[in-house]
Interface confidence: low
């Protein structure tokens, strides 16, 4: 439905508060280095303009597209060339090329200072002094660090952030009330950002068909009682929402997401019996709840898949007449029967089925050719099952920190060219799969673990894409979205790698390590571990364990010493010498 003024349409649909918040997010995700005050000024100008269009849709410039309006506004930033370099060249382009240009310059790892959390009293004072600015600052800081954060979901996080301060700043023990809530929001926020980053990578690198296939599988698992036509409609709508958000069209995205939540709740009888509670919530909570809702129970009497997809004489006819619909139905039918499989496994099975039909439907006897197609699924199913079993056993044996260390060593040996901070970040996240998924019963382990690993490996892929250093990473990241994890799993030690020169400075530590949080201290030790492996890729597990145990003892000893700095200097030299001897550096 055409509107005379798109900006007026979205302003009216979303309301002023959400409109302003979404424009701020959009601007901060594009111009990640701009100061907060500059963004607020731009947002206020856009909002005032939108209000004039609401009053009179025929007013000057009100008929312009949102990309044109927002792009023109971003291109008024005076320091664009100095701050962003070649991104300023985007402003010489016309829409839609200008927006595409801005999108290409989004930085997954912007050079921004780490967010340091002030004292609770300082935060509460700032919150009470100017609540609106305080909350805008939250949106700005998250959006600029996470340029693909799912904007309507960020509004939900901001609502929870506000609620935490409203409640805790009047509590007797503010810190005890607030800090756990902020930790939870931070951890959930990082997870949400990473999940959305995979959706955008899927759309942008592998296309709409890949995203739709993912959505068919996931929604069919979640809503197994819904019929195929229903799932198809939801997939179409969900694809539109995510395409818009990943493309920077945040107002349209938020508006369409609200419409989708409304549709789902109006039709929940046809979709899932698990939606009732979600649908009683206010909009932002409702959309979040629907996105996280548990899988509905599978219908009791689902017939065997073989009848329609292997035994039927019409398989090739049906496939030829509507390939994607037929494959979509296969994926839907398989996924609704298998909530115990990961989405990526289901997509591998569908790809195997498609490849088999492509080959067999051109054969002399198609039925004989594809009759055993389901047998080809067995090894594909067993591979992740075995891998998860082995890794959960290792996790239970080692605990999270040492399990992360095992993965750090494993991945550094596979792709030693990758930067140390990236290897530490990615391996730490890979290691979290243990505490996240191994506690689940067998039936929930694979969807938890393998789909989580897809999200984490995508982080490696997007960080590596910015500064490519390893052909092996590029290959695993680009060849097949659903086979990324098996591709990385299959990598052996990189025999072509020339070990890094030994640098004593890398292994020099100071007393400041003693005041770090446990997490920060772990990261320091894990950074040293990666560097060790880069120096000595052939080091055995036992050698590395011995060095790391010595290192932990050294840190503990010096942090208890009266003269910590002297201890770190003297004992550090001894440790480096002993480690060199142990590893033959």
């Amino acid at each position: 439905d055409a509107h005379k003024s798109e900006v007026a349409h979205r302003f009216k649909d979303l309301g002023e508060e959400n409109f302003k918040a979404l424009v701020l997010i959009a601007f901060a995700q594009y111009l990640q280095q701009c100061p907060f005050e500059d963004h607020v000024k731009l947002v206020n100008e856009v909002t005032e303009f939108a209000k004039t269009c609401v009053a009179d849709e025929s007013a000057e410039n009100c008929d312009k597209s949102l990309h044109t309006l927002f792009g023109d506004k971003l291109c008024t930033v005076a320091t664009l060339r100095e701050t962003y370099g070649e991104m300023a060249d985007c402003c010489a382009k016309q829409e839609p090329e200008r927006n595409e240009c801005f999108l290409q310059h989004k930085d997954d790892n912007p050079n921004l200072p780490r967010l340091v959390r002030p004292e609770v009293d300082v935060m509460c004072t700032a919150f009470h002094d100017n609540e609106e600015t305080f909350l805008k600052k939250y949106l700005y800081e998250i959006a600029r660090r996470h340029p693909y954060f799912y904007a309507p979901e960020l509004l939900f996080f901001a609502k929870r952030y506000k609620a935490a301060f409203t409640e805790c700043c009047q509590a007797a023990d503010k810190a005890a009330c607030l800090l756990p809530k902020l930790d939870e929001l931070r951890d959930e926020g990082k997870a949400s950002s990473a999940k959305q980053r995979l959706k955008c990578a899927s759309l942008q690198k592998f296309g709409e068909r890949a995203f739709k296939a993912w959505a068919v599988a996931r929604l069919s698992q979640r809503f197994p009682k819904a019929e195929f036509a229903e799932v198809s409609k939801l997939v179409t709508d969900l694809t539109k929402v995510h395409t818009e958000c990943c493309h920077g069209d945040l107002l349209e995205c938020a508006d369409d997401r609200a419409d989708l939540a409304k549709y789902i709740c109006e039709n929940q009888d046809s979709i899932s019996s698990k939606l009732k509670e979600c649908c009683e919530k206010p909009l932002l909570e409702k959309s979040h709840c629907i996105a996280e809702v548990e899988n509905d129970e599978m219908p009791a009497d689902l017939p065997s898949l073989a009848a329609d997809f292997v035994e039927s004489k019409d398989v090739c006819k049906n496939y030829a007449e509507a390939k994607d619909v037929f494959l979509g139905m296969f994926l839907y039918e398989y996924a609704r029967r298998h909530p115990d499989y990961s989405v990526v496994l289901l997509l591998r099975l569908a790809k195997t089925y498609e490849t088999t039909l492509e080959k067999c439907c051109a054969a002399a006897d198609p039925h004989e050719c594809y009759a055993k197609v389901f047998d080809e699924f067995k090894p594909l199913v067993e591979e992740p099952q075995n891998l998860i079993k082995q890794n959960c056993e290792l996790f239970e044996q080692l605990g999270e920190y040492k399990f992360q260390n095992a993965l750090l060593v494993r991945y550094t040996k596979k792709v030693p060219q990758v930067s140390t901070p990236t290897l530490v970040e990615v391996s730490r996240n890979l290691g979290k799969v243990g505490s996240k998924c191994c506690k689940h019963p067998e039936a929930k382990r694979m969807p938890c673990a393998e789909d989580y690993l897809s999200v984490v490996l995508n982080q490696l892929c997007v960080l590596h894409e910015k500064t490519p250093v390893s052909d092996r990473v590029t290959k695993c990241c680009t060849e097949s979205l659903v086979n990324r994890r098996p591709c990385f799993s299959a990598l052996e030690v990189d025999e072509t790698y020339v070990p890094k020169e030994f640098n004593a400075e890398t292994f020099t530590f100071h007393a400041d390590i003693c005041t770090l949080s446990e997490k920060e201290r772990q990261i320091k030790k894990q950074t040293a571990l990666v560097e060790l492996v880069k120096h000595k890729p052939k080091a055995t597990k036992e050698q590395l364990k011995a060095v790391m145990d010595d290192f932990a003892a050294f840190v503990e000893k010096c942090c208890k010493a009266d003269d910590k700095e002297t201890c770190f200097a003297e004992e550090g030299k001894k440790l480096v010498a002993a480690s060199q001897a142990a590893l033959g550096l």
């Epitope: 009682k225 819904a226 019929e227 195929f228 036509a229 229903e230 198809s232 009888d269 046809s270 979709i271 219908p299 017939p303 329609d308 039927s312 019409d314 006819k317 049906n318 007449e321 509507a322 619909v325 037929f326 139905m329 039918e333």
Partner: nanobody
Framework: EVQLVESGGGLVQPGGSLRLSCAAS????????MSWVRQAPGKGPEWVSA????????RYAESVKGRFTISRDNAKKTLYLQMNSLKPEDTAVYYC????????RNQGTQVTVAS
Amino acid sequence: EVQLVESGGGLVQPGGSLRLSCAASGFTFGSFGMSWVRQAPGKGPEWVSAIDSSGADTRYAESVKGRFTISRDNAKKTLYLQMNSLKPEDTAVYYCTIGRSTSRRNQGTQVTVAS
């Protein structure tokens, strides 16, 4: 977009007949088995009848066997349900589905059997 639109319902006396139609669009109708499902007031959905993609194989719930006939015209992308000897307990919203699911998304068509 996949769409299914039912029509042909109405008020009929016990023993009467009705013919329901379901017009399909947005997918290759001739490639898929189809079903009719019904939902009586205050009850869950009940599968009524199914037909394979070619129209050769038809199945019926015990409660309608011998009274209802499912058919299809792939050229017209339409599914039919001929209902004879209707009873008050056949009163329900009838809707068509792809495959053999009992979940509804489309509006359906109301059939009321009453004297």
